[in-house]
Interface confidence: low
């Protein structure tokens, strides 16, 4: 079978089972809720809002090819930090070894020569980048790790020739806001390959992503916090000076709400990425004296 | 390849501190994917998880042992270390520095170890 | 803490032989039970992660089963390489605690 053939059974294949475990998921919650016959608890949040455009002087990311529709992302997960997630296995555990295969034929022949010759190439990056970050939540977790394996192998391995288009799926599974899991994948792994953004896109993508780092820090789970204050340090070192005073305190804002929260790992993460905002801002001083007078009110 | 590395005294005196450094190479300890831990073991014996560092600074450690203990990350030489305060001969041990695999954090193994030190606590 | 109990604590074998290994958690810890092997004077290795995973280069001799408390770790045909002991982890919560290990001798 052709490289190209391969890609896109594999392609198909898991797409599909993804979106059976999502509606399983989704089948499994709802019977739960009858079960328990309690009010039901808030619903998953609704996808993102599109972001707005960039100004004027600001440029769209890339060109987009259009990708399939994504599943909607499921609800967030409990606001624990160590607990796993408990997932029924009934009826998906049968393919699961088909899975681990779809994910290293996917990441063998995505990085073949053949298929990054094709005319559909970025199309085709675009989609197994969304798979696998779409396996990073699977109930399984062998195929969690294995997404994961291939995500790095797949960064590695085109991040000369398609770094751009790699920062931007990772950016698009940012900006989804979904599973807890996808979203710590895409996050930690943006930070990493943020320093690389060309300088003329530094500023929409900062644009862009303001949205998406305030989203995230209002998310309930604890790991998702970790994640995204290890990540914020790197993202403003590389954007932070492409911000004007009103972004800055937008962010700022949104972290200084996370002080008043009852869990200390959210109060201590929120800390060190306030700082680290501050840090790498245009005017640092201004926006310490700024954040130490706000911290003030807030004991007065 | 992601190879980890145990350096420190070889022999330490009761009610002194120990500090130990593991040094990484093949992975960076400033990566949100992963948790950066410390084990040990006596001879013969079962063993110990001691506690674990996150990039973010948080730690979590083995109530038995926290009191006495810091891990904390030196992102700028890529090493992360601990350090034990209060020796008894009972903290005589190999030392093991790990990294909790990529995938999913919440339940990983340890898929990474060093070598190990051997600590011996005498006067 | 989740206590983590191996049976048996040592065992005999000879090469080609199928050995099996138990491991009981002290409370529900799902499928988050890891199995490593130590050789003396050597650090640990992980052999099978999440209960059944078989962790890549490891033979495929190893398997591992079992949810809940109580979980196995099987080598289906002994090698003279397989002599050594054996560990058991939870990492379902921290802290993370392991068996007292099942040292696997050659009959």
């Known amino acids: 079978m052709a490289t190209l053939e391969k890609l896109m059974k594999a392609f198909e294949s898991l797409k599909s089972f993804q979106q059976q475990q999502q509606q399983q998921q989704q089948q499994q919650q709802q019977q739960q809720q009858q079960q328990q016959q309690q009010p039901p608890p808030p619903p998953p949040p609704p996808p993102p809002p599109q972001l707005p455009q960039p100004p004027p002087q600001a440029q769209p990311l890339l060109p987009q090819p259009q990708p399939p529709p994504p599943p909607p992302p499921p609800p967030p997960g409990p606001a624990v930090a160590e607990e796993p997630l408990h997932r029924p296995k009934k009826e998906l555990s049968a393919t699961k070894k088909d899975r681990v295969n779809h994910c290293l034929t996917i990441c063998e022949n995505i990085v073949a020569q053949s298929v990054r010759n094709s005319p559909e190439f970025q199309k085709l990056l675009g989609i197994a980048m969304e798979l696998f970050l779409l396996c990073s939540d699977d109930a399984e977790s062998d195929v969690r790790m294995v997404a994961d394996e291939c995500l790095n192998k797949v960064i590695k391995a085109l991040m000369d020739s398609n770094l751009p288009r790699l920062q931007l799926e990772l950016y698009k599974e940012i900006k989804k806001n979904g599973a807890p899991r996808s979203l710590r994948a895409a996050l930690w792994r943006f930070a990493e390959l943020a320093h690389l953004v060309r300088p003329q896109k530094c500023r929409p993508y900062l644009v862009n992503l303001l949205p998406c780092l305030t989203r995230t820090s209002k998310r309930p789970e604890e790991s998702v916090q970790e994640t995204l204050a290890a990540a914020v340090p790197k993202i403003m070192a590389s954007f932070g000076n492409f911000a004007n005073d009103n972004e800055i305190k937008v962010l700022l804002k949104a972290f200084i709400a996370n002080l008043k929260s009852s869990s200390p790992t959210i109060r201590r993460t929120a800390a060190g990425s306030a700082v680290s905002i501050c840090q790498h801002s245009r005017r640092t001083q201004y926006f310490y004296s700024w954040l130490l007078n706000v911290l003030l009110g807030l004991l007065v | 390849q992601v190879q980890l590395q145990e350096s420190g005294p070889g022999l330490v005196k009761p009610s002194q501190t120990l500090s130990l450094t593991c040094t990484v190479s093949?992975?960076?300890?400033?990566?949100?994917?992963?948790?950066w831990s410390w084990i040990r073991q006596p001879a013969g014996k079962r063993l110990e998880w001691i506690g674990r560092?996150?990039?973010?600074?948080?730690?979590n450690y083995n109530p038995s042992l926290e009191s006495r203990v810091t891990i904390s990350l030196d992102t700028s030489n890529n090493q992360f270390s601990l350090k034990l305060t209060s020796l008894t001969a009972a903290d005589t041990a190999v030392y093991y520095c790990?990294?909790?695999?990529?995938?999913?954090?919440?339940?990983?193994?340890?898929?990474?170890w060093g070598q190990g030190t051997l600590v011996t606590v005498s006067s | 803490d989740i206590q983590m109990t191996q049976s048996p604590s040592s065992l005999s074998a000879s090469v080609g032989d199928r050995v099996t290994i138990t491991c009981r958690a002290s409370q529900y810890i799902s499928h988050y039970l890891n199995w490593y092997r130590q050789k003396p004077g050597k650090a640990p290795q992980l052999v099978i992660y999440a209960a059944s995973s078989l962790q890549s280069e490891v033979p495929s001799r190893f398997s591992g089963s079992g949810s809940g408390p109580e979980f196995t770790l099987t080598i289906s045909s002994l090698q003279p390489e397989d002599f050594a002991t054996y560990y058991c982890q939870q990492s379902y919560t921290t802290p993370r605690t392991f068996g007292q290990g099942t040292k696997l001798e050659i009959k």
């Open positions: 093949g992975a960076s300890v400033s990566s949100g994917a992963y948790y």
């Open positions: 790990a990294r909790e695999a990529p995938g999913d954090y919440d339940a990983a193994p340890l898929a990474y």
């Open positions: 560092v996150y990039p973010t600074w948080s730690t």
